[in-house]
């Protein structure tokens, strides 16, 4: 997260880190005791999932292996549409005050809505500085019409933009797949943006979760 702040401890109990060994690969969101939602571009052969701590690499955090993941069947490595994936944990998480599932959206929030994005991604760009603490940034949803002024045809119908006018605050390397939460519901998953990160008036681009609720529920049900 560029130009963000340290998240209030325990305020993001649904936030997970997808690790490759002990190294951060992507963010993710707990949606059920067996399931984590993340970006399709975060796919790996297997994952080490850290839950229940704001510190990356925390020894006291829950760590669960995941060997199965299900990309949206419409994910395109060319256009990056449908950049969403479910990761099935090999064993269920132990829910607690530190580990909770996020609330999936009942509706799509409108432009102007205040949201928070979080992650352990680099706080500087293009040179990287990875924080140990979970970082947050407060952003507002931007209309597709406004966002298309920047990204033109790169912006797909189920992509969502967020940012703050004239501000550098944005997501960056390592934040991918992490949550954009608005009014206590998951509205976005970090997908992409311009580089170096934090260029003012270049919004962050997210997968618009409200458009995928049915796919999420059906996939979890199919692979129970």
């Amino acid at each position: 997260i560029i130009d963000g702040y340290k998240c209030k401890e325990g305020s993001h109990p649904w936030q997970v880190a997808l690790l490759k060994g002990n190294q951060l690969h992507c963010g993710g969101v707990l949606v059920d005791k067996y399931w984590v939602l993340t970006a399709a571009h975060c796919k790996m052969g297997q994952y080490q999932v850290q839950l229940g701590s704001d510190k990356i690499g925390d020894q006291s955090a829950q760590k669960i292996k995941a060997t199965k993941s299900f990309r949206h069947p419409g994910y395109s490595t060319k256009t990056h549409v449908n950049d969403i994936m479910l990761v099935r944990l090999d064993e269920p998480v132990k829910m607690s005050s530190k580990v909770e599932a996020v609330q999936l959206p009942e509706h799509c929030e409108p432009p102007g809505t205040s949201c928070t994005v979080s992650g352990w991604g680099t706080t500087t760009s293009p040179d990287v500085t990875f924080p140990s603490d979970l970082m947050c940034s407060d952003v507002k949803l931007i209309s597709s019409r406004e966002c298309k002024k920047v990204y033109k045809d790169l912006l797909g119908k189920t992509m969502l933009c967020a940012g703050i006018p004239d501000s550098k605050t944005n997501t960056c390397n390592g934040d991918s797949g992490g949550p954009l939460v608005c009014n206590d519901t998951l509205q976005g998953l970090v997908s992409w943006g311009t580089y170096p990160c934090g260029q003012p008036n270049d919004p962050g681009v997210y997968t618009q979760v409200c458009k995928y609720k049915r796919w999420v529920m059906e996939t979890m049900k199919t692979h129970r």
Partner: antibody, heavy 122, light 108 residues
Framework: QVQLVQSGAEVKKPGASVKVSCKAS????????IHWVRQAPGQGLEWMGS????????NYAQKLQGRVTMTTDTSTSTAYMELRSLRSDDTAVYYC???????????????WGQGTMVTVSS | DIQMTQSPSSLSASVGDRVTITCRAS??????LNWYQQKPGKAPKLLIY???SLQSGVPSRFSGSGSGTDFTLTISSLQPEDFATYYC??????????FGGGTKVEIK
Amino acid sequence: QVQLVQSGAEVKKPGASVKVSCKASGYTFTSEGIHWVRQAPGQGLEWMGSISASSGDTNYAQKLQGRVTMTTDTSTSTAYMELRSLRSDDTAVYYCARAAGYGARHWYFDLWGQGTMVTVSS
Amino acid sequence: DIQMTQSPSSLSASVGDRVTITCRASQSISSYLNWYQQKPGKAPKLLIYGASSLQSGVPSRFSGSGSGTDFTLTISSLQPEDFATYYCDQFYSTPPITFGGGTKVEIK
């Protein structure tokens, strides 16, 4: 030191295969994609394809589809490009390059290997 | 696929000259165009990304401009080490990534 180091020059006969390696160091290999670009003698640059080091997702140039395979070995931070059924017009310098960006999209090549000369001759 | 056309294909100039190279895309690529310098026997080196942003470590005599379909690389005062071949590429509609044909800058 952030770098991409490629394998040495190769001489191959028409119809043979070649496998070029590209070893990354100084950065997190699995967080970036590796692209392959070639340059025939005295000619311009031609994009061949790309591979995501973490997912293994590949995209290949249409004209090389079926003849090229890109792979990675994350344990050694090495990318490989294999080209089969070699022809004389495959004689070129082959470069690996890192694409800079984050998340699903990348925007430019900010790091290149030194190049590997592949000569196809009977 | 988007075609990239560079002009001129070669030019002769003297040290201290202002040099301009153009790159035209077959359709709009917004500002997602990059410029590279390549010297004989060496790999290309990034100069400009996003049409106008100077890559770290690149001298300020290099500048880029343009958006949509027409782009320009300018060397304000040509230095001896600038004699090389210059390429543009587009990362807008990818894959494939497409390169311009190159412009060779030679000593007059």
